[in-house]
Every structure is written in structure tokens, then in C-alpha cells.
């Protein structure tokens, strides 16, 4: 799906101090979906503020969020997943600000896990594999993954590779010999559903072999 190409216009600046952002996670707990919202400004006094979602719900008109420290949270099976919901910040019965949001456009996948790297001596390459809970899901099954790796000494020099599978091969000759590397992976929805990058997986660290002087090849570890 092409979605909407951006033309550089800035989004609406909120007219008040209560601007917020939300993300949804589908089938995050069995068949339950979740919706998490938080204020953009961490200094907002949230003491009497509540969040409410209305519309595009099954069997009910509206649902109230639970407050968990600075975030507001719903876990439910009642998202219709078609049409726009109205999410409002409320104090008592008064709405301070509202947003019309289609929950299928603000999906944040769960972070990938079990990232590992195996060196194949005969092939002179590294096979990167990881897992994602989304392989078992019924809605957000198709993801784009972003694998990022760097030499440990290069603070901000990350190399990124985008892929749709959970397996990647890194050629040994593209990496520095006898170096320690850090690698991590994150995911974003890639078919119908839209939204945000997941959190990064925990990093995995691996060392590349020395160069074998006689053959010009790297030594395995």
C-alpha cells in the first residue's frame, strides 16, 4: 500500500499544552490489544487528567484508560480496527483536546528477540538470525526489520540493513578483522498496518576472526 507520501508540510501544532501521542499493539496479550498514550510534555501536571477513547469500538461507545505513572493504558478486545476513534484528554466531563486516530495506523510491534550471530568458516560469512512474536499473530504478521550493526569502537557509525525475513547473511570481507561488533534489530509494520518502529532488541556482541596471513583469510575464533 502506498500510504501517503509527505510533502514537507508541518503537522498541526497543538493549540494547548496537552498534546499527546499514542501507539497501539495488536494481540499483545493473547487476543487482547493495547493502546498506550502519553503527553509530549513530561512536565504536564497529570493529577486530574484522564484519557478516553470513543468510536470504532465493539459493544461499547467509550472506554477509559488506566493511568500507570506517566502513561495511560488500555488493554481490551473491543477495538473494531476499522474506522477512526476519538481519543480525548479530559478533566472531569470536559474535553481539553482530542485526536481522531485510526488504531491501525499507529501500530508499534513488539521488539524482536533471540538475536544471534553464527560464523560459518567455510562460507566466510556470519549468519544473523532473530525471532519475532509477530510470526504467530493474526493481524500484524508482515514486518520490515532494521538490523543495525557497528564496530564497538565506532560510537555512532551504525550500518543498517532492511529485510523482511528473520535471517541475514553478513559477508566476512565487509567487516573489519579481529574486531568486536555490536548488532541489534527492530521492526515496523509493512502490510496494511502502519505505525512506528518497535523498541530495539537487546544487543548481541560478536568478534570477527583474525586475518590468516598465509591465505589472506580471517582466522575463526
Amino acid at each position: 500500500e502506498s500510504g501517503y507520501a509527505q510533502n514537507g508540510d508541518l503537522e498541526d501544532a497543538e493549540l494547548d499544552d496537552y498534546s499527546f501521542s499514542c501507539y497501539s499493539q495488536l494481540e499483545v496479550n493473547g487476543s487482547q490489544h493495547s493502546l498506550t498514550c502519553a503527553f509530549e510534555d513530561p512536565d504536564v501536571n497529570i493529577t486530574n487528567l484522564e484519557f478516553e477513547i470513543c468510536g470504532a469500538l465493539v459493544e461499547v461507545k467509550c472506554l477509559n484508560f488506566r493511568k500507570l505513572q506517566e502513561i495511560y493504558f488500555i488493554e481490551t478486545k473491543k477495538f473494531l480496527l476499522i474506522g477512526k476513534s476519538n481519543i480525548c484528554v479530559k478533566v472531569g466531563e470536559k474535553s481539553l483536546t482530542c485526536k481522531k486516530i485510526d488504531l491501525t495506523t499507529i501500530v508499534k510491534p513488539e521488539a524482536p528477540f533471540d538475536l544471534s550471530v553464527v560464523y560459518r568458516e567455510g562460507a566466510n560469512d556470519f549468519v544473523v538470525t532473530f525471532n519475532t512474536s509477530h510470526l504467530q499473530k493474526k493481524y500484524v504478521k508482515v514486518l520490515m526489520h532494521d538490523v543495525a550493526y557497528r564496530q564497538e569502537k565506532d560510537e555512532n557509525k551504525w550500518t543498517h540493513v532492511n529485510l523482511s525475513s528473520t535471517k541475514l547473511t553478513l559477508l566476512q570481507r565487509k567487516l573489519q578483522p579481529a574486531a568486536m561488533y555490536e548488532i541489534k534489530v527492530r521492526s515496523i509494520p509493512d502490510h496494511y498496518f502502519k505505525g512506528f518502529w518497535s523498541e530495539w532488541s537487546p544487543s548481541y556482541y560478536f568478534r570477527t576472526p583474525e586475518i590468516n596471513n598465509s591465505s589472506g583469510e580471517m582466522d575463526p575464533i
Epitope: E1, S2, G3, Y4, A5, Q6, N7, G8, D9, E11, D12, A56, L80, L81, I82, G83, K84, K100, D102, T104, T105, K138, Y139, Y192
Partner: antibody
């Protein structure tokens, strides 16, 4: 009440351009995407593309890409569709329609007839 | 592009009788329980009007004699008891994949 009001009928020569407007009222303009749908005489419906008034982002049907441009003016709650290099097959009624969700159309304009004739 | 094939092309039904329109898609327009199929009614000289979204959800203000069902590639619009004002052309539309395509239409008349 929620309304989409389109500009009047147009008669154009082949090769010319036409710009049709659609003014929204009765709801917050930036809350909903607006799309354009073509209906040739006696024919069915064909999606041309849509625009998100909040960001100005557009999505076009590949068939019309390169000939269609959609813009929006938040100050007047109006969206525009410009179709260039007109040919006789472009003779049709053009509807603007609000997207109530992804991507179905819950409110429609009254339609604008565009006739392309030499 | 996803092709939507409606059947029949036209349908003549007695007042008070049931009218059934089918829409078949060239590939699935469902993601699990999310069915991205919608139905519209168009009367002569008027714009289309949304009746059903998400295969089975009745749009606000639409009489409940209209209902929708189906999943994957086969969908149905049913008018349980045809009224004179239901004479129109009915279109199905998918929204799983750009370009969002419509069926060719089914003309419903009174027998």
C-alpha cells in the same frame, strides 16, 4: 452537518487542465483524509487518489500518477484536484469523498461534471 | 490490482422480498477478522452513499434491513425486505490494497 461542496461543471479542450475544488464543513478539516473518485458516463466508480489535509501527504492511483495533483488549503477547508493533459476518456463526474476509515468513504460531495471535447 | 466481480449485474425483486448481491474479489481482502470490504448505494443523479463498512458494520442512519457478510474473497449485501426507495445501483469496494477498487455495480429494480 457534515458537508462537501464541489465546484461547478467544466468544459475543457483535449490537452488542457482542469482544477476541481471541494470545500468541507461541519467537522474538523484535518481529522479526515479526502479522496477523489471518477465516474464516467454510465460506468462504475474509480478511485483516483487522496490527500491528508493535516500533512498534505498524498496517495495516487498509479493509473493517474503524473497527470493528477491534489492539494489542500487549511485556511479555507478546501481540497483541490488538478487533472492535466485531458483527453476524451476523462469526461466524467468527479466526486470528492471523506474517508471515514481506511479507506471507505462516508461522506460524498455532489459531484463535478467535467466534459472534454474539441 | 484487486478485481471485484459483482453478481448479478441486475436484479428484479418484489416489494417486501429479499435481495442478495454478491461480490467476489481476485484475492483476499481480509486480515484475520478485519474484512476490508464496503458497500455503497447510488441512486440516479446522486453521489454514492455508504451503507456497510468492514463487511458487516452498518453505517449510522442506514436502515437495518441492509446487512453485509462474508470474508476473504466472498461477500454479500442483503436487503431483507425491499422497499421502493431501495431501487438503485449497489457497489462493493475493497480497501486492503492501493488502488482501492470498486465492483462493476448491481442494478436493483422492483419486479
Amino acid at each position: 452537518q457534515v458537508q462537501l461542496v464541489q465546484s461547478g461543471a467544466e468544459v475543457k479542450k483535449p490537452g488542457a487542465s482542469v482544477k476541481v475544488s471541494c470545500k468541507a464543513s461541519g467537522y474538523r478539516f484535518t481529522d479526515y483524509e479526502l479522496h477523489w473518485v471518477k465516474q464516467a458516463p454510465g460506468q462504475g466508480l474509480e478511485w483516483i487518489g487522496g490527500i491528508d489535509p493535516k500533512t498534505g501527504g498524498t496517495a495516487y492511483n498509479q493509473k493517474f500518477k503524473g497527470r493528477v495533483t491534489m492539494t489542500s488549503d487549511r485556511s479555507t477547508s478546501t481540497v483541490y484536484m488538478e487533472l492535466s493533459s485531458l483527453r476524451s476518456e476523462d469526461t466524467a463526474v468527479y466526486y470528492c469523498a471523506r474517508s471515514g476509515g481506511r479507506w471507505y468513504f462516508d461522506v460524498w460531495g455532489q459531484g463535478t461534471t467535467v466534459t472534454v471535447s474539441s | 490490482d484487486i478485481v471485484l466481480t459483482q453478481s448479478p449485474d441486475s436484479l428484479a425483486v418484489s416489494l417486501g422480498e429479499r435481495a442478495t448481491i454478491n461480490c467476489r474479489t481476485s484475492e483476499s481482502v481480509s486480515i484475520h477478522l478485519l474484512h476490508l470490504m464496503h458497500w455503497y448505494q447510488q441512486k440516479p443523479g446522486q453521489p454514492p452513499k455508504l451503507l456497510i463498512y468492514g463487511a458487516s458494520n452498518l453505517e449510522s442512519g442506514v436502515p437495518d434491513r441492509f446487512s453485509g457478510s462474508g470474508s476473504e474473497t466472498d461477500f454479500t449485501l442483503t436487503i431483507s425486505s425491499l422497499q421502493a426507495e431501495d431501487v438503485a445501483v449497489y457497489y462493493c469496494q475493497q480497501s486492503i490494497k492501493d488502488p482501492y477498487t470498486f465492483g462493476g455495480g448491481t442494478k436493483v429494480e422492483i419486479k
